[in-house]
Amino acid sequence: SRGSCDSLCNCEEKDGTMLINCEAKGIKMVSEISVPPSRPFQLSLLNNGLTMLHTNDFSGLTNAISIHLGFNNIADIEIGAFNGLGLLKQLHINHNSLEILKEDTFHGLENLEFLQADNNFITVIEPSAFSKLNRLKVLILNDNAIESLPPNIFRFVPLTHLDLRGNQLQTLPYVGFLEHIGRILDLQLEDNKWACNCDLLQLKTWLENMPPQSIIGDVVCNSPPFFKGSILSRLKKESICPTPPVYEEHEDPSGSLHLAATSSINDSRMSTKTTSILKLPTKAPGLIPYITKPSTQLPGPYCPIPCNCKVLSPSGLLIHCQERNIESLSDLRPPPQNPRKLILAGNIIHSLMKSDLVEYFTLEMLHLGNNRIEVLEEGSFMNLTRLQKLYLNGNHLTKLSKGMFLGLHNLEYLYLEYNAIKEILPGTFNPMPKLKVLYLNNNLLQVLPPHIFSGVPLTKVNLKTNQFTHLPVSNILDDLDLLTQIDLEDNPWDCSCDLVGLQQWIQKLSKNTVTDDILCTSPGHLDKKELKALNSEILCPGLVNNPSMPTQTSYLMVTTPATTTNTADTILRSLTDAVPLS
């Protein structure tokens, strides 16, 4: 084979991963490539002569974690083309000649997290095309010719980013589509053929219920003629649909039905590390539409470069600095007057210093999600005494301490999901006496210190997808006396004596407080069994079932099996490296 590192392709190693560059080598068949066995690699076959992917084409490339097939002429993908790529996390097949995504097109890609298929000629997506992609978070389909999406196309797909710009879509129903994308953070819908009639009411209502931090592109009407060019969100429901049809209960477009899909705690809003990679050439994307068209554009001196600003009535500024390659808050000059909301998501901020936010004392919301923050100097938020919402999700934090959160007397919402947090020191949340909602999902937590929630009026806590094998009730969970929602799923729970207390605590909670089933990981015979359905005797043979039995309170480091994979860790590893932008 001529396609090895010492001949056709250029190879280099980076952080234990081989980067195999076979770009523009006139390769006509994947079989021309051979790669070093037994090590993870990223492969770029950008700009070659590939016209078809044949069954088992990639079967010898089992350690691939990223494959770039952009700018080829691939018009057909045979069933089983991706066999053997069970480790693949990213697939770029943009700028090819695909016209259809078939039921089995992506068979074998069960670990895929990122799929880029923009700028093809896709008209048809078959019903189960994505059904096996149970880890897919980012799907980029802009600039194709998709006229409709089959019902339930994303039923089993945990998408957070979906780009459908530049297609031929006329409507998106709630049932079968919107109901399945409740975790979405970034939904791009511009430049389609939207028919602004009664059928689109469900989409309008659903969009209105999206949280303010979600990024949603404008839906511009294409028909009927008198609405052509109008933005859906600015039209009154009555004008779109003068005589509302009768909906079945589960389709009621009033808005209430959407809450299940958009506000449950396990949706983990703004929680992935992928905002920055969406600077892909999806249309060669620029600024997010609603950011670039603020209702009141301020004159230069008041809005820091390189941001866009919007006046919030009665006073105060909304400052959008999303995805502007900002490395430090000191880059924002001149400092704004009376900032109310500051959105710095998707930048490249590495650290936050004490001096950075001194002038931002009027802030009520600060969004630092999806940056690269490793260092949070103690007292960085000291002046932010009015802050109510703080987003630190999708960063590189590893430890939380009390000093980090000093000054946040009015904070109610704290988003820390998708970091690499391994340790929370005692008293960390004490500076936030009004904290109601805490997202810690998708981190590396194994233990919590005693009394960590003491005196903190938390109503919603998300501890999903960490490394907990057990969690004491006494001095930890029993401090959560205002709790209305807790998410504990997707942890490597060890269903043994130490978990009896947790089981009993869960059983005492009202029905909807625990959002998802807690499944055992160990011991082996209880793997995937539901904790609440198990008899205490099974958990702890010989146990006298005494509700007052003490539960473990000691603050011990718990070792978990090395085989336990951590979603946050893998996402951080796979998605923070620069993604080829072509």
Partner: antibody, heavy 120, light 107 residues
Framework: QVQLVQSGAEVKKPGASVKVSCTAS????????LHWVRQAPGQGLEWVGI????????VYAQKFQGRVTMTRDTSTNTVYMELSSLRSEDTAVYYC?????????????WGQGTLVTVSA | EIVLTQSPATLSLSPGERATLSCRAS??????LAWYQQKPGQTPRLLIY???NRATGVPARFSGSGSGTDFTLTISSLETEDFAVYYC?????????FGGGTKVEIK
Amino acid sequence: QVQLVQSGAEVKKPGASVKVSCTASGYIFNDYYLHWVRQAPGQGLEWVGIINPSGGSPVYAQKFQGRVTMTRDTSTNTVYMELSSLRSEDTAVYYCARGMVRGVRLFDYWGQGTLVTVSA
Amino acid sequence: EIVLTQSPATLSLSPGERATLSCRASQSVSSYLAWYQQKPGQTPRLLIYDASNRATGVPARFSGSGSGTDFTLTISSLETEDFAVYYCQQRTNWPLTFGGGTKVEIK
């Protein structure tokens, strides 16, 4: 209004290199791909390659691979096309052209062209 | 690469006449074919894309048809400003390729 302004005419000797610039204005630079297309005197149009101003590897026609380099400077909204090892048959007008927003492979605006003459 | 062959190379017609230009592809390009007009000393201008869609600002006398490998650009009634060279371009495959051009000249 959308404008693509190219650098002036160049006369080069065979074997030399030439670097042509194309400065964009009137639209958000990062939102649109830019292509380079050339036209030899009295001849048809020939696609050279494409670059995404917001980043990533440029893509070149196989014919020019190894001789052409496209780069970008987002601070000045400028893209560059450098062609090396020039030969007489590279004498042509070189155009930069913007890819349409919803049809990257179509050209909706063109620069005025830069005549590159390769002559001993 | 996909080769586009235009015919005739030159078309001599009078104003008011109908012009029919042909473009043939060496393999199917579906409907992804565009037509450009270039006047002497000027840059090309997009007229038709995806075989039959008129670009913004293009007069209704220009129309396109065809799919697969055979395409036609029709100018229903030639105006003096229509005398120019016309190129077809396919966008199905990389590299993007153009036809050799058809010159429409005044008879």
